[in-house]
């Protein structure tokens, strides 16, 4: 069937970066500026995505592939193919409808995006807290209290929070 189709359909010979031009006797024409075709045999070229406003161009459009956007500094991508840009917050905060808010006690966020998460429950794994959590950092779990030698202190104060911490992805 494929062979028959290629014999009957001249469009199947048009490579990526071209389209099968009905107005010109079905010859393969290059995609016009600001358009692309990523597969062969296409009858039209797709319009290139434009990265405007809070979006910035990560990869320019070519005749065979669409442009790719990311976000300007202070924002991060959300959704497939970076369909949205969301405001960054500081470590130790999360974005709410009212803007960036500090993490509640017992929760942390070590990134500039995402939500405040509860500190890890070390006892879930039979471990103890080795380093206390902060708004910016999770606890670090250590050995179970039974594993500690007598007189050894089990909890270390948290390491001082520093930028940049976990960078936004």
């Amino acid at each position: 069937f494929e062979r028959t189709r290629s014999l009957q359909d001249p469009c199947s010979n048009c490579p990526a970066g071209t389209f099968c031009d009905n107005n010109r006797n079905q010859i393969c024409s290059p995609c016009p500026p600001n358009s692309f075709s990523s597969a062969g045999g296409q009858r039209t070229c797709d319009i290139c995505r434009q990265c405007k406003g809070v979006f910035r161009t990560r990869k320019e459009c070519s005749s065979t592939s669409n442009a790719e956007c990311d976000c300007t500094p202070g924002f991060h991508c959300l959704g497939a193919g970076c369909s949205m840009c969301e405001q960054d917050c500081k470590q130790g905060q999360e974005l709410t409808k009212k803007g960036c808010k500090d993490c509640c006690f017992g929760t942390f966020n070590d990134q500039k995006r995402g939500i405040c998460r509860p500190w890890t429950n070390c006892s879930l794994d039979g471990k103890s807290v080795l380093v206390n959590g902060t708004k910016e950092r999770d606890v670090v779990c250590g050995p179970s209290p039974a594993d500690l030698s007598p007189g050894a202190s089990s909890v270390t104060p948290p390491a001082p929070a520093r930028e940049p911490g976990h960078s936004p992805q």
């Epitope: 429950n121 670090v140 960078s167």
Partner: antibody, heavy 119, light 107 residues
Framework: QVQLVQSGAEVKKPGASVKVSCKAS????????INWVKQAPGQGLEWIGN????????NYNQKFKDKATITADKSTSTAYMELSSLRSEDTAVYYC????????????WGQGTTVTVSS | DIQMTQSPSSLSASVGDRVTITCRPS??????LNWYQQKPDKTVKLLIY???RLRSGVPSRFSGSGSGTDFTFTISSLQPEDIATYFC?????????FGQGTKLEIK
């Protein structure tokens, strides 16, 4: 005991995709980060990304953002990593790992899955 | 990304020797430094986490020290079963990054 068991070796053609699985047992799957790490032949280790299975929140190494997609199925305690548009440089052993209790270290490693890309 | 400079890339030592490997991150990572052992069969094991904390079940001949941008991993008395490649890894900042590894051989 805590265990991560990965799917078997794969041989794929350039341009194809592959989905590697990592089945967790011996702990509460939703409470720990699962990471994926790449080791190309004769090379060091590279962190690809991770997922928190409870809400499927992911982080990616920018280098692998267009290559890897990490997902998790809570019902089967299994994490997955799909690699797309495979090229010869994707030939490597891929490991899944679990954190030690907080994301900052990786205490349990799967046995590794070899992915070979060859025409 | 934080670069992890690990040295030496390989070393040969005798059973009973004291072996030292260093790891230098390109920026301050506080104490978020871990050490892993990869055996010739490719199995990987966490030995030390948070710079100096020995993972439960790991022999006490393994130790770690340092902070900020200078870290050291030591095997106090090398054993035949310690033949492996050792990696440092920073857990301070995404993306997590590893040193290039130190291949340890017995003389």
């Amino acid at each position: 005991q805590v265990q991560l068991v990965q799917s078997g070796a794969e041989v794929k053609k350039p341009g194809a995709s592959v989905k590697v699985s990592c089945k967790a047992s011996g702990y509460t799957f939703t409470s720990y980060w699962i990471n994926w790490v790449k080791q190309a032949p004769g090379q060091g280790l590279e962190w690809i990304g991770n997922i928190y299975p409870s809400d499927s929140y992911t982080n990616y190494n920018q280098k692998f953002k267009d290559k890897a997609t990490i997902t998790a199925d809570k019902s089967t305690s299994t994490a997955y990593m799909e690699l797309s548009s495979l090229r010869s440089e994707d030939t490597a052993v891929y490991y899944c790992t679990r954190d030690y209790g907080s994301a900052y270290s990786m205490s349990t490693w799967g046995q590794g899955t070899t992915v070979t890309v060859s025409s | 990304d934080i670069q992890m400079t690990q040295s030496p890339s390989s070393l040969s030592a005798s059973v009973g020797d004291r072996v030292t490997i260093t790891c230098r991150p390109s920026q301050d990572i506080s104490n978020y430094l871990n050490w892993y052992q990869q055996k010739p069969d490719k199995t990987v094991k966490l030995l030390i986490y948070y710079t100096s904390r020995l993972r439960s079940g790991v022999p006490s001949r393994f130790s770690g020290s340092g902070s900020g941008t200078d870290f050291t991993f030591t095997i106090s008395s090398l054993q035949p079963e310690d033949i492996a490649t050792y990696f440092c890894q920073q857990g301070d900042t995404l993306p997590y990054t590893f040193g290039q590894g130190t291949k340890l051989e017995i003389k």
